[in-house]
């Protein structure tokens, strides 16, 4: 669809005569009839297949035509067509004399014709005017013409219909060739697809209007590139939604079980070395001079009774010092200056000469020891405390300080590892010689039944339209991550326009 436009510029009829040569009285009141038709090698009479148009009286004899409305007529003249422009045409322009006001063909005498011109040729659609001038014996007509497309029609033949729009069905304007030109922020064949916020994750995000980024279930962040961990996940992260991958030193389904008590709580004192030995369990290796579960107790260096032969021990800042009884010397009073003649054996010990009387040895009665039978037997020397318990002399008696997991007078009893109910999710606990064992109920596994091995809710492929399925471990249900263009719990519905706000 388009318009053939004809712009009449000047008509010269100096003598004011008709085609017959007869003069007009009082002058030639001139109007024009235009016939546009298909291309003919020789332009002949017949139907004006592309259309006709007539002007009002534009002037008398010779005159210029203004390029706007003139006496109710339009200049340029419009010859609309509702077909593909063929690129060729024939044009007939007749100048007529109007003796009266009735310009209809049947109201005019046949000899009222002033002049008639006929041209034919090819003409491409375009904005540029073609200027032409036709001269006969008595008249001259100057005019220009062109073909342009109607509103919303484009292309070389005005055959491409394109109407700009900005609604749900498209967001575009039209290019000169009739192709769509998407408005900023839109893309796709019909410019219906919004261009999301720059960087918005292709799978995890989508948008319903330009420059936004809406996150699919389980994702968050400005670009929907951060997964949301399993609800209740304490010390863990995720790489896909609803995961809970534990940070170093944490375990359990929700990463809330402390496997690195040493690092998280630093229980060992006085520079001791800490070793993790299970959930919330640890062992401290004390530096010399310290004792206790957490190495919190300072040992006196005299506690080991380093002074011999009845020497008395004195604690000092940098160690200890032995005060030797008469007849003894040395760091630990280990050297004697006595012989049996000096009766060196205490507590009923009997003396035996050695090295021709230069030395001696005491044979002690039961419950006494030492080179001079000066010490009561240390009840701890026989290591009576089992399972690594620490023996402590307490006056006439002794006691054992047990390591974690043991009890009894001699630490001989194993504390049940099951007493702490270590098996998660209703697992059954069995005490073993070196620890424990959990028998897990259906749906759980792992050393402590902490790993959920429930049926994969995604196994039945419940998501439609190539959506990605995720299993929600807390509920044994599935979540469908929909591709662009689909919504619904199973991505079964084509997308509409989602509301922007929950109000």
């Amino acid at each position: 669809s388009g318009v053939f436009q004809l712009q009449l510029q000047e008509f010269i009829n100096e003598r004011g005569v008709l085609a017959s040569g007869r003069p007009c009285e009082p002058g030639c009141r001139t109007f024009f009839r235009v016939c546009l038709k298909h291309f003919q090698a020789v332009v002949s009479p017949g139907p004006c297949t592309f259309g006709t148009v007539s002007t009002p009286v534009l002037g008398t004899n010779s005159f210029a035509v203004r390029d706007d409305s003139s006496g109710g007529g339009r200049n340029p003249l419009q010859l609309p067509f509702n077909f593909t422009w063929p690129g060729t045409f024939s044009l007939i322009i007749e100048a007529w004399h109007a003796p009266g006001d009735d310009l209809r063909p049947e109201a005019l005498p046949p000899d009222a014709l002033i002049s008639k011109i006929a041209i034919q040729g090819s003409l491409a659609v375009g904005q540029n005017w073609l200027l032409d001038e036709q001269t006969s014996t008595l008249t001259r007509l100057r005019y220009s013409y062109r073909v342009i497309c109607s509103d919303n029609y484009y292309g070389d033949n005005c055959s491409r219909l394109c109407k700009k729009r900005n609604d749900h069905f498209g967001h575009y304007v039209c290019q000169p060739d009739g192709n769509l030109s998407c408005l900023p922020g839109w893309t796709g064949e019909y410019c219906q697809q919004p261009i999301c916020l720059s960087g918005c994750h292709e799978q995890n995000g989508y948008c319903s209007k330009p420059a936004e980024c809406l996150c699919r279930p389980g994702w968050q962040g400005r670009l929907c590139n951060e997964c949301i961990p399993h609800n209740g996940c304490r010390h863990g992260t995720c790489s896909t939604p609803w995961q809970c991958t534990c940070d170093e030193g944490w375990g359990g389904l929700f990463c809330d079980q402390d496997l690195n008590y040493c690092t998280h709580h630093s229980p060992c004192k006085n520079g001791a070395t800490c070793s993790n030995s299970g959930q919330r369990s640890y062992t401290c290796t004390c530096r010399p001079g310290y004792t206790g579960v957490d190495c919190e107790l300072e040992l006196s260096e005299c506690d080991s009774n380093p002074c011999r032969n009845g020497g008395s021990c004195k604690d000092q800042e940098d160690g200890y010092h032995c005060l030797c009884p008469p007849g003894y010397y040395g760091l630990h009073c280990e050297h004697s200056t006595l012989s049996c003649a000096d009766s060196p054996c205490f507590n009923g010990g009997s003396c035996r000469e050695r090295n021709q009387g230069a030395n001696y040895a005491c044979e002690c009665p039961p419950n006494f020891t030492g080179s001079n039978c000066e010490k009561k037997v240390d009840r701890c020397t026989s290591n009576p405390c089992a399972n690594g318990g620490q023996c402590l002399n307490r006056g006439p008696s002794r006691m054992c300080r047990c390591r974690p997991g043991f009890t009894g007078t001699y630490c001989e009893l194993h504390v049940s590892d099951c007493a702490r109910n270590p098996c998660a999710h209703g697992g059954t606990c069995h005490d073993l010689e070196n620890g424990l064992m959990c028998t897990c109920p259906a749906g759980f596994s792992g050393r402590r039944c902490e790993v959920r091995t429930s049926i994969d809710a995604c196994a039945s492929s419940p998501c439609f339209n190539r959506a990605t399925c995720y299993t929600d471990l807390s509920t044994d249900t599935f979540v469908c991550n929909c591709p662009y263009g689909f919504v619904g719990s199973r991505c079964e519905f084509p997308v509409g326009l989602p509301p922007s706000f929950p109000w």
Epitope: L197, C200, C207, A211, E212, C213, L214, C215, Q220, G221, R222, L223, C224, E226, I228, P229, H230, N231, G232, C233, R234, S500, F501, P502
Partner: nanobody
Framework: EVQLVESGGGLVQSGGSLRLSCAAS????????MSWVRQAPGKGPEWVSA????????YYADSVNGRFTISRDNTKNTLYLQMNSLKPEDTAVYYC????????????????WGQGTQVTVSS
């Protein structure tokens, strides 16, 4: 059941300060980005500020930038909004919410919502 409960709103003179709190329960607060949204009488909702799950990244609307400060304490499951140099145009109901969708300037779609707390700034 997810709950977001805002508090700390009230009537304050222009130029004054308020601190809003949002107590979260029923979900792992420390795993979610959070934001503050406000709605003035007769107007649509307006995004105010947002903070990522760890608390290290913050965003502000131009209208409050430099005056408001968003923060969070994941050990207390609480979101905060410190509002200084308040203006009469800050008068609105303030909501805390979990952002679900972002536009070029900030969040505009949300998952969980609180019930809101009224802030009125008199001139």
């Amino acid at each position: 059941e997810v709950q977001l409960v805002e508090s700390g709103g009230g009537l304050v003179q222009s130029g004054g300060s308020l601190r809003l709190s949002c107590a979260a329960s029923g979900f792992t607060f420390g795993s979610y980005d959070m934001s503050w949204v406000r709605q003035a009488p007769g107007k649509g909702p307006e995004w105010v500020s947002a903070i990522n799950s760890g608390g290290g990244i913050t965003y502000y609307a131009d209208s409050v930038n430099g005056r408001f400060t968003i923060s969070r304490d994941n050990t207390k499951n609480t979101l905060y909004l410190q509002m200084n140099s308040l203006k009469p145009e800050d008068t609105a109901v303030y909501y805390c919410a979990t952002p679900r969708g972002w536009g070029p300037t900030g969040p505009h779609e949300y998952g969980y919502w609180g019930q809101g707390t009224q802030v009125t700034v008199s001139s």
